[in-house]
């Protein structure tokens, strides 16, 4: 592979996935293409297909196991190699050792519900999904709300420094549609990342009683 | 800035192992993406493997093979290079490099990535 041509990024899910993307300039749309990973102390090793999602880009997911299970530890290092179909044998196109409580972006936070509303106020619980025992409580989430008339790039971000499964919305408008989102991020790792905006939770304030001052 | 110098080479014999040592010191060594190159006689250089600040990724020349792992220790300021299985065609001066700019893992950069250098250590593998 040559410098600024190829990209080879992978991520874990902290339980049993493995992420992963694969881009190639000038890489034809219909080569086929794997991605095998061989830990350095498993018994087992994994192959996902890479398929495409864009132009130049392919991913796949290495499935290690049942999605709670835990399949690899803070000292596992894991051997991820690209390759390809080239007539009737396989070209290694690239080679990665990947340390995957280094490489972390955990699942988007699921089970988002309203456990109370008032005219002003939200409160909002979610869960966290295939999340690693290993962090405890090392984990930060971002939130954000999405209110009338604006973007979510508008929305301003909510921080949450510790592992809170919950956020009471203040200073809402009484009767008006929002929509929220929260995701998450282990506090541990060098490439670790966001884990993808949950699902948008759509809920309504209640109205303002009548005759009251607002 | 890091003064970098390698170590471990020398002659061996076709299917044995070696590792290669290369101290830095005179500077942060963690906030710097280390490499290892190699150059043999009448060749130009050509990368063997690259680790990042924190070796959370370390991308391999596709011509290893799987033979060579390279590690580092940011508490002694050091990176290795494990070359198992060796053959004659591994002869050649290898080179340790600290790249300053950031470097992710995701890719393979070229010599001219790379900043600093060491000095070399022969590696002469006899069949």
């Known amino acids: 592979a040559v410098n600024g041509t190829s990209q080879f990024t992978c991520f874990y899910n902290s339980r049993a996935n493995i992420s992963c993307v694969w881009s190639q300039d000038g890489a034809l749309q219909d080569t086929s293409c794997q991605v095998h990973a061989w830990p350095d102390r498993r018994r087992w090793n994994q192959t996902c297909e890479l398929l495409p999602v864009s132009q130049a880009s392919w991913a796949c997911n290495l499935i290690l196991g049942a999605p709670d299970s835990q399949k690899l530890t803070t000292v596992d290092i894991v051997t991820l190699r690209v390759l390809c179909r080239e007539g009737v044998r396989w070209r290694v196109m690239a080679i990665q050792d990947f340390k995957p409580f280094e490489n972390l972006r955990l699942m988007a936070p699921i089970s988002l519900q309203v456990v109370h509303v008032e005219t002003h106020r939200c409160n909002i619980s979610w869960e966290i999904s295939q999340a690693s025992h290993y962090f405890e409580r090392h984990l930060e989430f971002e939130a954000r709300t999405l209110s009338p008339g604006h973007t979510w790039e508008e929305a301003p971000l909510l921080t949450l420094k510790q592992k809170q499964e919950w956020i009471c919305l203040e200073t809402l408008t009484p009767d008006t549609q929002y929509e929220f989102q929260v995701r998450v991020k282990p506090l541990q790792g060098e490439f670790t990342t966001w884990s993808p905006w949950s699902q948008p939770l759509a809920f309504r304030t209640k109205p303002a009683a009548l005759g009251k001052d607002t | 800035e890091v003064q970098l110098v390698e170590s471990g080479g020398g002659l061996v014999q076709a299917g044995a192992s070696l590792e290669l040592s290369c101290a830095a010191s005179g500077g942060t060594f963690s906030s710097y993406a280390m490499g290892w190159f190699r150059q043999a006689p009448g060749k130009e250089r050509e990368f063997v493997a690259a680790t990042t600040r924190g070796g959370g990724r370390t991308m391999y020349a596709v011509s290893t093979e799987g033979r060579f792992s390279c590690s580092r220790d940011n508490a002694k300021n050091t990176v290795n290079l494990l070359i198992k299985n060796l053959k004659p065609e591994d002869t050649a001066v290898y080179y340790c490099?600290?790249?300053?700019?950031?470097?992710?893992?995701?890719?393979?950069?070229?010599?001219?990535?790379?900043?600093?250098w060491g000095q070399g250590t022969q590696v002469t593998v006899s069949s």
């Open positions: 490099a600290a790249r300053t700019s950031y470097y992710d893992g995701t890719y393979y950069p070229a010599s001219s990535d790379f900043d600093i």
